[in-house]
């Protein structure tokens, strides 16, 4: 066979050619276009392998280059004014011949974020190394070059030509040479598939003898999607060789007659095609024996078949039909598994959300996290749940147990807490005394005071009604008990005594604010918001002064 001068690979329904040339991307595209093609697409790993094969052919035809790295244009470009789009596999680039964006990509490195200039893609090759099938050339993005200035390391380009279909290469039954001329003006004698509309020139004979015959064939569409040369029987047959030369040009079996003639035949499960050379499988799948979305796979020699199911399905007992696989049987999820047709999904229990290491993992939802706590006061996160708590002087309330309600200590089950008057406040209480009596230092008892005709001492003045958070400690003829929000440790003795501020003035209260409530001598205070330390009150003087505070992370801490 003569040495091919051009690099060409044909497979599927396309041919790829590789060329040397320090050209801009536009010049390279024009050369491909002149022959009816475009700069090559690389839309799949399979196509990347075809492109690599044609580049390997090109490199074999040329001595090793001095340059180590070389670049070859392919048909991936991003127009001027279109920005890089990192969310897409092609990053905003598109194939020059049109066609859909595909998920396959093989970028050399992270792309630069640009919008202004047109950008073009080349395949980056180490020209000093042989191209290995496992290491497909990487995609390199850069300027598209201009005439006379192709860009750094640009060595050539790859074209792609698409066809309706392909013919099998012609097989010779005796000495001879086949030369194919493709529609894209490439000549080759070693194509694994020959594109539709190619011409085959067959020269039979040893070459140096006068007995050479010439045959000319065209690859035609004989029937829809059936491509054939229109030749009949092996070419260049010679009685001298019989079946000994290239198996007589037969695809499978070659049978010799006594007179030096021979015939081609096929193995069981195959049939001889009209060219009397090629064998095709007697397709056991033609009767569509597989059901339920199963694919029929012909067995060897066309004798039998197997049915194959899509992912997530398996064959039933008949081995012909597909049924859903219950993936949940294998417990692939951390918590809940829901089987779906052909697949499954993982779900998390209430109080958990997807996350954590591994597929289908769940992690606890921190219901108490900053800004999301459902509790009115204290919140404690637990695995898969949470619970609310209330400061001392409040109890959990509400249907869902997230609210806090004030405890009225003045009507508590333990009996009167104060010797005389008792004033309930938000989260606390205070003691007071009737006119003529003053509150003893213990904040609970009353002692005889200077004779006075005024109202009882104790409840706050009208001006304190509805007092705001952060206000000063109200008049201290009343006192607050030592406890949680006002500072007591949780181990406060059960006999609680209110705190009395040492510098608080003793004030009188208009009689109309006093109204009998409950047993004689027990009085209720008008609705007043008593500021606790947690909401900005001053720290009470005297007694225990431990104050509940809140840390940056939203947790409670002791100051």
């Amino acid at each position: 066979t003569g040495a091919d001068t051009e690099a060409v690979v044909c497979a599927g329904t396309a041919c790829y050619t590789a060329h040397w040339g320090k050209l801009s991307a536009a010049e390279a595209q024009n050369l491909c276009l002149q022959n009816g093609g475009n700069l090559a697409t690389v839309k799949s790993e399979e196509e990347a392998q075809h492109v690599q094969q044609v580049l390997a052919q090109l490199l074999r035809r040329e001595a090793a280059l001095t340059a180590r790295m070389g670049k070859f244009w392919i048909g991936l470009q991003r127009e001027k004014g279109k920005c890089l789009d990192p969310s897409l596999p092609l990053k905003g680039f598109s194939w020059v011949g049109g066609g859909e964006d595909t998920p396959y990509s093989n970028w050399h490195k992270e792309l630069r974020n640009s919008c202004i200039s047109k950008r073009c893609v080349s395949l980056l090759l180490d020209l000093s190394q042989p191209l290995l099938p496992g290491r497909l050339p990487k995609w390199s993005e850069g300027p598209c070059g201009s005439p006379g200035s192709p860009g750094s390391n640009i060595e050539g380009f790859v074209c792609k030509f698409s066809f309706k279909g392909m013919c099998r290469p012609l097989a010779l039954g005796g000495p001879g040479q086949v030369t194919y001329t493709t529609p894209f003006q490439t000549t080759s004698s070693s194509l694994e598939a020959v594109p539709f509309a190619s011409a085959a020139n067959v020269a039979c004979g040893e070459g140096d003898k006068d007995d050479s015959q010439s045959h000319y064939f065209l690859c035609k569409e004989k029937a829809p999607d059936v491509f054939d040369w229109g030749s009949s029987g092996p070419l260049c047959v010679s009685p001298k060789y019989g079946c000994n030369f290239n198996n007589g040009g037969c695809h499978q079996d070659c049978f010799e007659g006594g007179d030096g003639s021979f015939l081609c035949g096929c193995r069981p499960g195959f049939r001889l095609l009209d060219d009397l050379v090629t064998c095709a499988s007697r397709n056991p799948c033609s009767s569509s024996p597989c059901r339920g979305g199963a694919t029929c796979i012909p067995g060897p020699h066309g004798k039998n078949y197997t049915c194959r199911c899509p992912q997530g399905y398996q064959l039933d007992s008949s081995q012909l039909d597909c049924v859903d696989v219950d993936e949940c049987q294998d417990s692939p999820c951390a918590q809940e598994c829901v089987n779906t047709p052909g697949s499954f999904r993982c779900e998390c229990w209430v109080g958990y959300e997807p996350g954590g290491p591994g597929e289908g993992a769940c992690q606890d939802v921190d219901e108490c996290a900053l800004g999301r706590s459902p509790c009115a006061q204290g919140c404690t996160n637990t695995e898969g749940s949470f619970h609310c708590s209330c400061e001392e002087g409040y109890v959990l309330a509400g249907e869902d147990g997230t609210q806090c309600q004030d405890v009225d200590e003045c009507v508590g089950p333990g009996g009167p807490l104060c010797d005389s008057l008792c004033f309930n406040t938000q989260g606390s209480f205070r003691c007071g005394c009737l006119p003529g009596w003053v509150l003893a230092p213990n904040g609970v008892s009353c002692a005889m005071g200077p004779v006075s005709l005024g109202p009882p001492s104790g409840p706050p003045d009208e001006e304190y009604k509805g007092e705001r958070e952060g206000s000063t400690v109200p008049p201290a003829a009343t006192a607050s008990p030592t406890r949680g929000p006002e500072g007591t440790p949780k181990s406060t003795p059960t006999t609680r005594r209110p705190l009395l501020s040492s510098d608080a003035p003793i004030t009188s209260v208009p009689l109309e604010v006093l109204a009998p409530s409950g047993s004689p001598g027990l009085w209720r205070e008008p609705s007043i918001h008593h500021t606790t330390a947690a909401s900005g009150a001053q720290e009470p003087a005297g007694g225990d002064s431990s104050v509940a505070t809140q840390n940056d992370d939203g947790t409670d801490g002791q100051k």
Epitope: K82, D85, S87, N113, C115, I116, S117
Partner: antibody, heavy 115, light 109 residues
Framework: QVQLQQSGAELVRPGASVKLSCKAS????????MHWVRQTPVHGLEWIGG????????AYNQKFKGKATLTADKSSSTAYMELRSLTSEDSAVYYC????????WGQGTLVTVSA | QAVVTQESALTTSPGETVTLTCRSS?????????ANWVQEKPDHLFTGLIG???NRAPGVPARFSGSLIGDKAALTITGAQTEDEAIYFC?????????FGGGTKLTVL
């Protein structure tokens, strides 16, 4: 680290021209576009244009075509913007910013156009 | 020329999540608009936060994220901090030019 050092403040007469510079360091100058933005109290931030130092390709806001010219000197890793036929409306702080994602910004150059 | 609209001001509290949006007068914002988000702090200090819709710039804390929400570009700050108080600008690309929004003044109280 990446730095964009802009030239100092300019006081110019109406009708005159001025050339602002933006010296890049800490990265390969030709790897990223350089964009120019201006800020005024009236119009806020306005994109003027951008240049690809590798190819010299430019893009301009229609409003600034004829007003601004962008250039880049690869040897000194410096981008330039020339503003011409200045009026009081061109008084602003002018910024250079690296790449089409505006990741890094210069400190700005105050241009005051006054008679 | 297209008009890009942002909330003029937003207020949030430390630890809260806040989302700033960026609307285009020409229709839905898509990834081809390559939305950029820039932070301006006092003294004209600009920092790029997000480029190309959802790519965090080098050194930008993970609490900043970019996305498309409905027909708008969005910048979300998950767990805002007091130092995030600033003016935030978005810029959208329209085939051959960028257009900036008017900026959102974010207050973190």
């Amino acid at each position: 680290q990446v730095q964009l050092q802009q030239s100092g403040a300019e006081l110019v007469r109406p009708g005159a021209s001025v050339k602002l510079s933006c010296k890049a360091s800490g990265y390969t100058f030709t790897d990223y576009e350089m964009h120019w933005v201006r800020q005024t109290p009236v119009h806020g931030l306005e994109w003027i244009g951008g240049i690809d130092p590798e190819t010299g390709g430019t893009a301009y806001n229609q409003k600034f075509k004829g007003k601004a010219t962008l250039t880049a000197d690869k040897s000194s890793s410096t981008a330039y913007m020339e503003l011409r036929s200045l009026t009081s409306e061109d008084s602003a702080v002018y910024y250079c910013t690296r790449g089409a994602w505006f990741a890094y910004w210069g400190q700005g150059t105050l241009v005051t156009v006054s008679a | 020329q297209a008009v890009v609209t942002q909330e003029s001001a937003l207020t949030t509290s430390p630890g809260e999540t806040v989302t700033l949006t960026c609307r285009s007068s020409t229709g839905a914002v898509t990834t081809s608009n390559s939305a950029n988000w820039v932070q301006e702090k006092p003294d004209h200090l600009f920092t790029g936060l997000i480029g190309g819709t959802n790519n965090r710039a080098p050194g930008v804390p993970a609490r900043f994220s970019g996305s498309l929400i409905g027909d708008k570009a969005a910048l979300t700050i998950t767990g805002a901090q007091t130092e995030d108080e600033a003016i935030y600008f978005c810029a959208l690309w329209y085939n051959n030019h960028f257009v900036f929004g008017g900026g959102t003044k974010l207050t973190v109280l």
